[in-house]
């Protein structure tokens, strides 16, 4: 998904939460210097995915993928790329 | 930078009502099974998390959005 390239750490954390992998979540949260209370809060969200099973994780992953690859986001990504190109060109 | 539509989805997941969150998801995927799952997850999060927990989760999101990795 193109959007994952624009904010990889968000998708790292999201998929760690949705997959129910506590170790992966800890590693991802370390990258953004999350505090202990912040980690506890994210683990509570993760618990909901774990409790509702594999289908729940797959379906919510589908939602995130759909939103991220929607016109709303892809239009944004294209716009950002155009802006970056303008800045790079002007900066030379 | 995170896409505003994704940011809105996550914000509503934490701070919106179940109806607001499900309505947001429905704009992208109308499958009943997907929307029922969205409501179940939202209700679970609302039941498990205190206001303080939600503030902490939002704080993590702020750190994510301002991270060099985003």
């Amino acid at each position: 998904v193109k959007m994952a390239e624009t904010c990889p750490i968000f998708y790292d954390v999201f998929f760690a939460v949705a997959n129910g992998n506590e170790l992966l979540l800890d590693l991802s949260l370390t990258k953004v210097n999350a505090t202990e209370p912040e980690r506890t809060a994210m683990k509570k969200i993760q618990d909901c995915y774990v409790e509702n099973g594999l289908i729940s994780r797959v379906l919510d992953g589908l939602v995130m993928t759909t939103i991220s690859s929607s016109k709303d986001c892809m239009g944004e990504a294209v716009q950002n790329t155009v802006e970056d190109l303008k800045l790079n060109t002007l900066g030379r | 930078e995170i896409c505003p539509a994704v940011k809105r989805d996550v914000d509503l997941f934490l701070t919106g009502t179940p109806d607001e969150y499900v309505e947001q998801v429905a704009q992208y995927k109308a499958l009943p099974v997907v929307l029922e799952n969205a409501r179940i997850l939202k209700n679970c999060v609302d039941a498990k998390m205190t206001e303080e927990d939600k503030e902490n989760a939002l704080s993590v999101l702020d750190k994510i959005y301002t991270s060099p990795l985003c």
Epitope: S69, S70, K71 | V22, A26, K29, A30, P32, R39
Partner: antibody
Amino acid sequence: QVQLVESGGGVVLPGRSLRLSCAASGFTFSSYLMYWVRQAPGKGLEWVAVIWYDGSNKFYGDSVKGRFTISRDNSKNTLYLQMNSLRAEDTAVYYCARDNGNSGYEDSWNAFDIWGQGTMVTVSS
Amino acid sequence: DIQMTQSPSSLSASVGDRVTITCRASQDIYNYLAWFQQKPGKAPKSLIYAASSLQTGVPSQFSGSGSGTDFTLTISSLQPEDFATYYCQQYNNYPFTFGPGTKVDIK
């Protein structure tokens, strides 16, 4: 056989209210999502609203949001559309329709299969 | 909202002709597309769902194809009862939206 019969249409003044009903028979009403779709005279079809089996989820078309309310009474096998603050542009034939899928994860979900014959609503002063 | 467009808006054909109607979505709707037939003064009739699956009782001269943004309804051999208006509709996300319709009349 499977049947949907709408009623409650008529002529109404702008700003007033009207409630449409759709009586279902020949199937387990409580197992299906139900819809309202309308068609203005000489125009195309416009999706109005949907309601879940148990009423837990309801969604509306942009033009009716905040004015129309979809509901159902599974004990009476009846679908309703409460229409408030009616406008001239709400003049249309209103159809109720049944969802195609009632189990599993198939791609038949959300597609309409059975339609009622329609009831005419005229909003005019 | 997803915009649906249909072409042509009308066409004239003879009994036995092969007729093709196209429908385009303004964004990806996967295969969440339905086709309906409507005759004057009557309720719409469901023909196809999931882009290519025939509703129960629909004659085999009707077929649908496509995925993503481009879809086609084909009537392999037009019958006298097939003269009507045909609508496509997306049901990938809310609000559901219909195409403007294609009127098929007798040449």
